[in-house]
C-alpha cells in the first residue's frame, strides 16, 4: 500500500480467483484514543472500533472511503483505491491501446518544435468518475524538471456504438536547450483513477523523436508565362524553431489529381519554392519534416491548381 | 578547416558532408526504433557516447561568439563514432551485408573529421570504451543503440554547419 496523495492510498493486489488479498491497517488521524468507530462509504454499518482498523482487501467491495467517527463527528477519511496485477502485469483497463506506433501504446506525444514544449494525449471509452494526474521529468535517476498542466477533455468522437473520449495535456521542460543533443529521455507518468480503480501509464521519449512540424504556411501558386508549370512557394510554420538557418526543414511537394487513383507527382526540396506542372482539377500539397532528423512529417498544406 | 589555433572551417564543405552523413545514418538504420529492446539485457551496452550538450557552444549564439568549442566537440564525436563503426561491433558477426551503408558512413565520418582537423593538429579525443560483446546478438543491440545516437549527433552537427555556412562563412 502506498499514498497517492493526502488521505488517498493505493492497494496493490495480485488479481486471480481466491487470491488472499492484502491486509491493510488504517489509522484514524486524531489525538482521540477511544470511542472511535469506522464506516465505509455511505453505509452506517460499523466495521470496527478503535484508533486502528485492520481489513483484508481482496476486491473492489473492500475499497472506498473509510471514515473514522466519534460521537457522530467525522475525525478523518482514508480513500482506498485498487491497483490490479494479473499474471504479473498491471491492468490497463482505463485507457485504450492506440496501437500506433506499436502495440501497448496508451500515451502518444508530439512536439511542434525543439522548445521543450510537447503535448500528450490518450483515449478512453469511460465518460464519468474519471480523473487524471500527469507528472513528467527529464531522466529518472536524477530528474530535471518538466511542468505539466491539467489534463483536459480535448475531443469526443463516435466509434461504432461507442463514444471515445480524448484527453490531452501540455508540458514544458523547465530549462530546455533546443540546440543540444538529448542524452536523457523525457519521462511522462499518467495516474488514472476510475471510481476505485487506479492505473498508471508511462511513456519515455526524446523530443527529437516526437517532433511533428505544423504544416507550411502561406502556400501560394504563381503561374509561369507560356507554360503549364507553376511556381509553388510557402513559408516555414510560425511554430517552428528559429533561426531557420539552424533549425532547417525539408519539404515534400505533391501534385494530386481529383481521383485518389491518379499517379501522384512528388518533389523533395530544401527550398521554400518549387516548380511543378499543374494539372486541371489537381491540387498541390506541401508538407515539412526536420531536415536532419527523420521524425514525423507535418500534415499537408494544400491549394487547388485552378 | 578548423584548426586548434582558431581559423574558420570550410563551412560549406562541412555542411554538404554533414548532410550526407545524416542521410547515410538514416539509410543504415531507417527504423525510428520501434524494436522491442526491453527484453534484451542492457549490461553490455553503453551510454558513454559523446553528446553535444548545452554548454558546448553549438547553439546559434555560441557559434557566433566562438565556434571553436563546438567544432572541437563535434570533432571528438566524429572520431569516437568513426572508431566505433570500425570496431568489432560492426565488423564482427553477424556480418553486415556487402551493400550496407555502414561502410560509407564510416568513411564519411572520417572525411568530415579530417575537414575539421587537418594533419599535424591534434585536439583531444575521447577514449572509446572497449566493447567486445560476448554474444553475437548483443552486437545487434549495440549497433542499434550506436546508430540511433549517431543519428541524433549528426543532426546537431549538420545544423551547426548549415548555420555556419549561412551566417559565418567569409
Amino acid at each position: 500500500i502506498w499514498e497517492l496523495k493526502k488521505d488517498v492510498y493505493v492497494v496493490e493486489l495480485d488479481w486471480y480467483p481466491d487470491a488472499p488479498g492484502e491486509m491493510v491497517v488504517l489509522t484514524c488521524d486524531t489525538p482521540e484514543e477511544d470511542g472511535i468507530t469506522w464506516t465505509l462509504d455511505q453505509s452506517s454499518e460499523v466495521l470496527g472500533s478503535g484508533k486502528t482498523l485492520t481489513i483484508q482487501v481482496k476486491e473492489f467491495g473492500d475499497a472506498g472511503q473509510y471514515t473514522c467517527h466519534k460521537g457522530g463527528e467525522v475525525l478523518s477519511h482514508s480513500l482506498l483505491l485498487l491497483h490490479k496485477k494479473e499474471d504479473g502485469i498491471w491492468s490497463t483497463d482505463i485507457l485504450k491501446d492506440q496501437k500506433e506506433p506499436k502495440n501497448k501504446t496508451f500515451l502518444r506525444c508530439e512536439a511542434k518544435n525543439y522548445s521543450g514544449r510537447f503535448t500528450c494525449w490518450w483515449l478512453t471509452t469511460i465518460s464519468t468518475d474519471l480523473t487524471f494526474s500527469v507528472k513528467s521529468s527529464r531522466g529518472s535517476s536524477d530528474p530535471q524538471g518538466v511542468t505539466c498542466g491539467a489534463a483536459t477533455l480535448s475531443a469526443e468522437r463516435v466509434r461504432g456504438d461507442n463514444k471515445e473520449y480524448e484527453y490531452s495535456v501540455e508540458c514544458q521542460e523547465d530549462s530546455a536547450c533546443p540546440a543540444a543533443e538529448e542524452s536523457l529521455p523525457i519521462e511522462v507518468m499518467v495516474d488514472a483513477v476510475h471510481k476505485l480503480k487506479y492505473e498508471n501509464y508511462t511513456s519515455s521519449f526524446f523530443i527529437r523523436d516526437i517532433i511533428k512540424p505544423d504544416p507550411p504556411k502561406n502556400l501560394q501558386l504563381k503561374p509561369l508565362k507560356n507554360s503549364r508549370q507553376v511556381e509553388v512557394s510557402w513559408e516555414y510554420p510560425d511554430t517552428w524553431s528559429t533561426p531557420h538557418s539552424y533549425f532547417s526543414l525539408t519539404f515534400c511537394v505533391q501534385v494530386q489529381g481529383k481521383s485518389k487513383r491518379e499517379k501522384k507527382d512528388r518533389v523533395f526540396t530544401d527550398k521554400t519554392s518549387a516548380t511543378v506542372i499543374c494539372r486541371k482539377n489537381a491540387s498541390i500539397s506541401v508538407r515539412a519534416q526536420d531536415r536532419y532528423y527523420s521524425s514525423s512529417w507535418s500534415e499537408w498544406a494544400s491549394v487547388p491548381c485552378s | 578547416r578548423a584548426v586548434p589555433g582558431g581559423s574558420s572551417p570550410a563551412w560549406t564543405q562541412c555542411q554538404q558532408l554533414s548532410q550526407k552523413l545524416c542521410t547515410l545514418a538514416w539509410s543504415a538504420h531507417p527504423l525510428v526504433g520501434h524494436m522491442d529492446l526491453r527484453e534484451e539485457g542492457d549490461e553490455e551496452t553503453t551510454n558513454d557516447v559523446p553528446h553535444i550538450q548545452c554548454g558546448d557552444g553549438c547553439d546559434p549564439q555560441g557559434l557566433r561568439d566562438n565556434s571553436q568549442f563546438c567544432l572541437q566537440r563535434i570533432h571528438q564525436g566524429l572520431i569516437f563514432y568513426e572508431k566505433l563503426l570500425g570496431s568489432d561491433i560492426f565488423t564482427g558477426e553477424p556480418s553486415l551485408l556487402p551493400d550496407s551503408p555502414v561502410g560509407q558512413l564510416h568513411a564519411s565520418l572520417l572525411g568530415l573529421s579530417q575537414l575539421l582537423q587537418p594533419e599535424g593538429h591534434h585536439w583531444e579525443t575521447q577514449q572509446i570504451p572497449s566493447l567486445s560483446p560476448s554474444q553475437p546478438w548483443q552486437r545487434l543491440l549495440l549497433r542499434f543503440k550506436i546508430l540511433r545516437s549517431l543519428q541524433a549527433f549528426v543532426a546537431v552537427a549538420a545544423r551547426v554547419f548549415a548555420h555556419g555556412a549561412a551566417t559565418l562563412s567569409p
Partner: antibody, heavy 126, light 111 residues
Framework: QVQLVQSGAEVKKPGSSVKVSCKAS????????ITWVRQAPGQGLEWMGE????????YYNEKFKGRVTITADKSTSTAYMELSSLRSEDTAVYYC???????????????????WGQGTLVTVSS | DIVMTQSPDSLAVSLGERATINCKAS???????????LHWYQQKPGQPPKLIYN??KLESGVPDRFSGSGSGTDFTLTISSLQAEDVAVYYC?????????FGGGTKVEIK
C-alpha cells in the same frame, strides 16, 4: 560448386589429440565462417564452435574447457579443429559446415549452416 | 546454456498426414521481440544435416509442405503432408547465445 572436404577417419588413444582438417572450395573462404559439429554414434548433434576468418572471431562451446582449438589458414582455404586430452566419449563423427551469418545493420538475423563436409569419424580407444 | 527440448522423441505418421514437431527453449531465442534465432535441420541416415528452415524463412529448394512457426521459447515445425522422402531426424538449433545448442532430435517415420 561449394565443397567442404574433410580429412580421413582417425583412431586415437585416450589422452592424445586429433586434428581434423576441412578444405573449402567453390566460394570466397573469408566471406563465411566454418562451424564444427559432432555426433556421437546414435546420438544427436553437438555444436563445438565456429571461426570467422574475416573478422578473426572464434566462438567456442565452453563444455570443451579449452580442449578444442579451431583455426583457419586463409592461404589454403582450410579450417582445422583440434581436440586434445581425448577420452572414449569423444568418439564421434566430426562435421565441418560453412556458416553464413549476416544481418542488415540490426536485423533480420540470418544464420545458415548451408554446406557440410562428409564427416570424419574419430574413434578413441585404448 | 540455453537448453533446447524437442518433443516427441519419435513420431510415426501415415503418408499424406500432418507431422508436428515441437521445440522448447529454456530461455527466449527471439531477438528484439521478433527476429527468430531458431533454425530447423533435417538429417537422413548416413548423411550430414541439411538446413530446411532458417528463422522464419523456408530455405530455397525445400518443399513448401514444411512450415515453421513460434516465437519466444516455443517453436513448431510442421510437415503438412508427409512424403516418403521426409523420413529423417529433425533437429532445432538456437544461435541466439553461444554455445549454440541443438535439440535432442525427433525421428519421423511412416506409419
Amino acid at each position: 560448386q561449394v565443397q567442404l572436404v574433410q580429412s580421413g577417419a582417425e583412431v586415437k588413444k585416450p589422452g592424445s589429440s586429433v586434428k581434423v582438417s576441412c578444405k573449402a572450395s567453390g566460394y570466397t573462404f573469408t566471406s563465411y565462417g566454418i562451424t564444427w559439429v559432432r555426433q556421437a554414434p546414435g546420438q544427436g548433434l553437438e555444436w563445438m564452435g565456429e571461426d570467422y576468418p574475416r573478422s578473426g572471431n572464434t566462438y567456442y562451446n565452453e563444455k570443451f574447457k579449452g580442449r578444442v582449438t579451431i583455426t583457419a589458414d586463409k592461404s589454403t582455404s582450410t579450417a582445422y579443429m583440434e581436440l586434445s586430452s581425448l577420452r572414449s566419449e569423444d568418439t564421434a563423427v566430426y562435421y565441418c559446415a560453412r556458416a553464413e551469418f549476416i544481418s542488415t545493420v540490426v536485423a533480420p538475423y540470418y544464420y545458415a549452416l548451408d554446406y557440410w563436409g562428409q564427416g570424419t569419424l574419430v574413434t578413441v580407444s585404448s | 546454456d540455453i537448453v533446447m527440448t524437442q518433443s516427441p522423441d519419435s513420431l510415426a505418421v501415415s503418408l499424406g498426414e500432418r507431422a508436428t514437431i515441437n521445440c522448447k527453449a529454456s530461455k527466449k531465442v527471439t531477438i528484439f521481440g521478433s527476429t527468430s534465432a531458431l533454425h530447423w535441420y533435417q538429417q537422413k541416415p548416413g548423411q550430414p544435416p541439411k538446413l530446411i528452415y532458417n528463422g522464419a524463412k523456408l530455405e530455397s529448394g525445400v518443399p513448401d509442405r514444411f512450415s515453421g512457426s513460434g516465437s519466444g521459447t516455443d517453436f513448431t515445425l510442421t510437415i503438412s503432408s508427409l512424403q516418403a522422402e521426409d523420413v529423417a531426424v529433425y533437429y532445432c538449433l538456437q544461435n541466439k547465445e553461444v554455445p549454440y545448442t541443438f535439440g535432442g532430435g525427433t525421428k519421423v517415420e511412416i506409419k
